[in-house]
Amino acid sequence: CKAMHVAQPAVVLASSRGIASFVCEYASPGKATEVRVTVLRQADSQVTEVCAATYMMGNELTFLDDSICTGTSSGNQVNLTIQGLRAMDTGLYICKVELMYPPPYYLGIGNGTQIYVIDPEPCPDSDF
């Protein structure tokens, strides 16, 4: 298959509420109208799919209702947000972009964004 450049930040720190956002950019070698974006998590040499969405250029990105991901697209950039993260979810999150239509099919895979998640300290008991 044909390939393309995909870029994403090296490191992102999740918020105290377990939300991490990053931009996934791709250099489209052709005039794609249908794009599929997949977020993969790599930890301990195992790769699992976190979420995926297909969108038409110019339209919103739609993930499944029960997905932990949300996103918006703008040109050849996708702003991805992953929610509900906990310390155990720390890992390398890889953006995979596929130009589905029209042919030719292009596939690009980013180097990955290391997302660090720190569970918030529980609040100390209070008499107030």
Epitope: A3, H5, A7, F22, E25, A27, G30
Partner: antibody, heavy 116, light 108 residues
Framework: EVQLVESGGGLVQPGGSLRLSCAAS????????IHWVRQAPGKGLEWIGW????????KYAQKFQGRVTISRDNSKNTLYLQLNSLRAEDTAVYYC?????????WGQGTLVTVSS | DIQLTQSPSSLSASVGDRVTITCRAS???????LAWYQQKPGKAPKLLIY???NRATGIPSRFSGSGSGTDFTLTISSLQPEDFATYYC?????????FGQGTKVEIK
């Protein structure tokens, strides 16, 4: 008119650092992938690395990994190249160039001479 | 890394001659990612051909590109005085992006 103008070159001591700038005008800077390419005197072209439109992603040639940083400030339409631990072999003209794959516009280049 | 080897490294030709420069890749390159540049002394390179065969904006029709896989060619159908320069091929995927060593076209 599309323009890329490099600056910051000059004489640098071995072991020193340099920071080159590339000022862009005549196009929407934040829409484009930009690269740095260099050319040693009398030699061919050598790719250093690229930066994505938002600046969120960079990629470098293996030989520059850990010694080079490409960054950009889209609010200033400016690209930067930081190169550390300079040696004589880094003497070259440094160019910025626009485009993800083929480079349709290049700057005029800035000469960096590494010598004591 | 993909190595690009140009041949010849230099050539002498006359105005009006047909000139062919070859670029051979160490492994297959998609034609989408093969470009040719012209460089004159003291100047930045100038894009001539992209996607192996498409002329860049403002490039005269005497310049043409062809090829696929590992073998690509730049042809100048009728050499003009302003064409004496050094020509480079470039591949842009996968990284690292690489250039050929250049072909210098000189006046005979």
């Amino acid at each position: 008119e599309v323009q890329l103008v490099e600056s910051g070159g000059g004489l640098v001591q071995p072991g020193g650092s340099l920071r080159l700038s590339c000022a862009a005008s005549g196009f929407t800077f934040s829409d484009y992938w930009i690269h740095w390419v260099r050319q040693a005197p009398g030699k061919g072209l050598e790719w250093i690395g690229w930066i994505s439109p938002s600046g969120g992603g960079t990629k470098y040639a293996q030989k520059f990994q850990g010694r080079v940083t490409i960054s950009r400030d889209n609010s200033k339409n400016t690209l930067y190249l930081q190169l550390n631990s300079l040696r004589a072999e880094d003497t070259a003209v440094y160019y910025c160039a626009r485009g993800a794959y083929e480079f349709d516009y290049w700057g005029q280049g800035t000469l960096v001479t590494v010598s004591s | 890394d993909i190595q690009l080897t140009q041949s010849p490294s230099s050539l002498s030709a006359s105005v009006g001659d047909r000139v062919t420069i070859t670029c051979r890749a160490s492994q297959s390159v998609s034609s989408r990612f093969l470009a040719w540049y012209q460089q004159k002394p003291g100047k930045a390179p100038k894009l001539l051909i992209y996607d192996a065969s498409n002329r860049a904006t403002g490039i005269p029709s005497r310049f043409s590109g062809s090829g696929s896989g590992t073998d690509f060619t730049l042809t100048i159908s009728s050499l003009q005085p302003e064409d004496f320069a050094t020509y480079y091929c470039q591949q842009s995927y996968p990284t690292p992006l690489t250039f050929g060593q250049g072909t210098k076209v000189e006046i005979k």
